[in-house]
Interface confidence: low
Amino acid sequence: LVITPPGPELILNVSSTFVLTCSGSAPVVWERMSQELPQEMAKAQDNTFSSVLTLTNLTGLDTGEYFCTYNDSRGLEPDERKRLYIFVPDPTVGFLPNDAEELFIFLTEITEITIPCRVTDPQLVVTLHEKKGDIALPVPYDHQRGFSGIFEDRSYICKTTIGDREVDSDAYYVYRLQVSSINVSVNAVQTVVRQGENITLMCIVIGNEVVNFEWMYPRKESGRLVEPVTDFLLDMPYHIRSILHIPSAELEDSGTYTCNVTESVNDHQDEKAINITVVESGYVRLLGEVGALQFAELHRSRTLQVVFEAYPPPTVLWFKDNRTLGDSSAGEIALSTRNVSETRYVSELTLVRVKVAEAGHYTMRAFHEDAEVQLSFQLQINVPVRVLELSESHPDSGEQTVRCRGRGMPQPNIIWSACRDLKRCPRELPPMLLGNSSEEESQLETNVTYWEEEQEFEVVSTLRLQHVDRPLSVRCTLRNAVGQDMQEVIVVPHSLPFK
């Protein structure tokens, strides 16, 4: 870009006419205060573009910045924009007029600012004063911009002398604002409501004095506006709140509610959204699953948990074998339903030191006036195995038998093992397993009975040993899902007189 004359600063006479030319490799345009000026644009044969700006009947108000830039200057580099400053000394114009917002300078931190009092003549001496004082402040002055420095929260004026008269500028007010990066929070009294209930949302900004709230909500899209209320939370410094209240919600009010907050000083903005659901009627819905068969271990505590979503808050009941359960005074059963989020609940049944009698069919029922859900499962009490009896006998047939009896829930497995070398058994040599060999040395017979009243299995296993020629250590091991137990007996050959 080439400007003629090149500037960067020109001093022109009042009432004169002046021509400025700008040329470049693409269409160019003259601008002042972000506005295009009336100008003549042309394209030369050598594919250069130019724009001629004719300033006529100049006055002091023509003092200021002029820019030449490419016509489509979006995204162009800074050096693809040329600046020119023109002074038109005019004794009838004191200080150049300011827009109202230029008279109020808002500070958000201790930083250098400019008080933009400008004159038409670069030769004039300009001084800065506090509004209520005569002493000139030691602040540097730039005729094109004004006074730049670090200023306190005060009122300031600029002074100059034109001819023999003293001229004062308008007063400039410097305010230091409480402004932080915007931190918006949005919450609702309820995010789920039924038709006809109220929707109330609050948008809170902390740490800012000057903010603007804008709400977006489903009703607004259909042109039905709701007037929010903005207030200050007086007990907290710089807490500003906007409340959006929609009485008697409709299904169409479901959707996203967004609070957009802008702070005009630093142009910061933040927005937060919240989803509101308006339901035709209330609901109860299970989340996740609970298996149809649950287990608890005898004499241990067991907590059974059901997670569900519901609105409005439901009543929760637990039943065992169709009998309503309640917290027992003996502390054997504890019931609790916790509201873990607005519409999410966790209901827990805790059985303390579980007893066999607590096995059975359990049901949780959650309900309110609109809906209900129920979940059922069977509770099985697991009992660790116990070996109740291990005995050895010598029937007349000549064989020797070892009988092992034990109980547990679920059904125990039985494992027989034996050691011939008593000195090294059972630590060093693995015992040989019995009862599953095809040899005729041993035979096994096992019977299982389920005892309904005790809700456990009894296993009776008889091991028949054919040829015992030296002492034999026989072990019976019972195992189930929750434990194992064992006993040993020494079987002595018939021929030996002792046991």
Partner: antibody
């Protein structure tokens, strides 16, 4: 207008993993009013519900498939996905994604067009 | 799981005649607290996704012709097509949404006689 569109490979080898995506347009998957589900229909057979998902990540599955199924959501892309592991020829089916309301319970009111997945070597 | 059964497996009806499909659930899908039956009916045409016709056992989905109606309560339900049209040729499924897993009936094929 709400539209659901399933996408994924039409052919998967036995024992491999089947992955499908359902893209939701004309509405937000983050709506707190809906669940998003998968249903399948093997050739010549009836419909079978696989599982459903809430945008926050809550899932519930058909117990018959639970050990092999994962349903997940990507709210930034407005889509949700189905993964079915260790597939066999019995998993050959048209897979549909669908929407149902978050109420006490509700039917599937919007369905995708469906995509045929064949399990074969 | 709640098992849904349908009868008949297929039926052929003359144009303009009434078609009736039955659906039975293995347990009641009526919630006593709101007196609603958690049953839906869908229409499935080849190459198209299922289309919801009826929910709450008897409420017609918007846009569904009024020749389609649903009835029944508890465990026994019926879908009736009052006057069969050519475009009604399809397979019809009932579905319970009373509890998970949601289950569908095996379907009933409707043709023109």
């Amino acid at each position: 207008q709400l539209q659901l569109q399933e996408s994924g490979p039409g052919l998967v080898k036995p024992s491999e993993t089947l992955s499908l995506t359902c893209i939701v347009s004309g509405g937000s998957i983050s709506s707190s009013s809906y669940y998003w589900g998968w249903i399948r229909q093997p050739p010549g057979k009836g419909l079978e519900w696989i599982g459903s998902l809430y945008y926050s990540g809550i899932t519930f599955y058909n117990p018959s498939l639970k050990s092999r199924v994962t349903i997940s959501v990507d709210t930034s892309k407005n889509q949700f996905s189905l993964t079915l592991t260790s597939v066999t020829a019995a998993d050959t089916a048209v897979f549909y994604c669908a929407r149902h309301r978050v109420m006490a319970s509700s039917p599937f009111d919007h369905w995708g067009q469906g995509t045929l997945v064949t399990v074969s070597s | 799981d709640i098992v849904m059964t349908q009868s008949p497996e297929s039926l052929a009806v003359s144009l303009g005649e009434r078609a009736t499909i039955n659906c039975k659930s293995s347990q009641s899908i009526l919630y006593s607290s709101n007196n609603k039956n958690y049953l839906a009916w869908y229409q499935l045409k080849p190459g198209q996704p299922p289309n919801l016709l009826i929910y709450w056992a008897s409420t017609r989905e918007s846009g569904v012709p009024d020749r389609f109606s649903g009835s029944g309560s508890g465990t026994d339900f019926t879908l009736t097509i009052g006057s069969l049209q050519a475009e009604d040729v399809a397979v019809y499924y009932c579905q319970q949404y009373y509890s998970t897993p949601f289950t569908f009936g095996p379907g009933t094929k409707v043709d023109i006689k």
